[in-house]
Interface confidence: medium
Amino acid sequence: QGWQAFRNDATEVIPGLGEYPEPPPENNQTMNRAENGGRPPHHPYDAKDVSEYSCRELHYTRFLTDGPCRSAKPVTELVCSGQCGPARLLPNAIGRVKWWRPNGPDFRCIPDRYRAQRVQLLCPGGAAPRSRKVRLVASCKCKRLTRFHNQSELKDFGPETARPQKGRKPRPGARGAKANQAELENAY
């Protein structure tokens, strides 16, 4: 059972593997693609210039939680945010932006690269700590949306058994490993 979504201590949901934050629906369409007939006339900006895009990488530091367990240390990951359009053409206030070619392919600010990180989970009540390998967003990029982006193509890393901590004494009231595992599974 992998973590489909991590909840932080503020009950925000961090998308699990193969998922990414969906930006709000936009009317933004792109242009300057060979299949679309090239650049529209008199268009002064190059759509391939990354600096013209406002796909932002927001850093979030939070604890990852899994049932009653929580990561020993906070984890920092990126959340992709923003609209994929030339920055100078985006509105200052909230609103929709109409591009030149309303029927062009849709570009979104979504994760580009991921990184794997081992996270130690601390579980209360005498349960043994565990570790998980999780996949976190490492960078964002404006990408052309395909029908596959609506599906979860990636799978979560499976749970891994944590090595016992050195010098850790048995705690009063602690149950056996099987009881702990069953308890945690039942509590999810």
Epitope: R7, T65, R70, A72, Q120, L122, G125, G126
Partner: nanobody, 120 residues
Framework: EVQLVESGGGLVQPGGSLRLSCAAS????????MGWYRQAPGKQRELVAT???????NYADSVKGRFTISRDNAKNTVYLQMNSLKPEDTAVYYC??????????????WGQGTQVTVSS
């Protein structure tokens, strides 16, 4: 030395309510988790609800929607509001405190337990 003192247990009719309290005294690290566990006769101790110092909560499926865990960090006290009690909730309820220092468990304490009996 840390001590946990539970209170609020008792006899209640099915459908009734009880509020358990657990006060921790002593030197307690700020990063900690407090929780309630219960043990019915002949059964293993099981998790009821936990709450981290940050406020993150977790409940056993059997009590979701009926029990609410809360805490007062200033008083190092955790509460368990139990509503719509059922006979199967009858058990000894134990308070637990675990503290964390530099990412590892520093201590784990248990209270003596308080009896909750749900019967008509």
């Amino acid at each position: 030395e840390v001590q946990l003192v539970e209170s609020g247990g008792g006899l209640v009719q099915p459908g009734g309510s009880l509020r358990l309290s657990c006060a921790a005294s002593g030197s307690i690290f700020s990063d900690n988790v407090m929780g309630w566990y219960r043990q019915a006769p002949g059964k293993q101790r099981e998790l009821v609800a936990t709450i981290w110092s940050s406020g993150h909560t977790n409940y056993a499926d059997s009590v979701k929607g009926r029990f609410t865990i809360s805490r007062d960090n200033a008083k190092n006290t955790v509460y368990l509001q139990m509503n719509s009690l059922k006979p199967e909730d009858t058990a000894v309820y134990y308070c637990n405190l675990g503290t964390i220092v530099t990412g590892t468990w520093r201590s784990d304490y248990w209270g003596q337990g308080t009896q909750v009996t749900v019967s008509s």
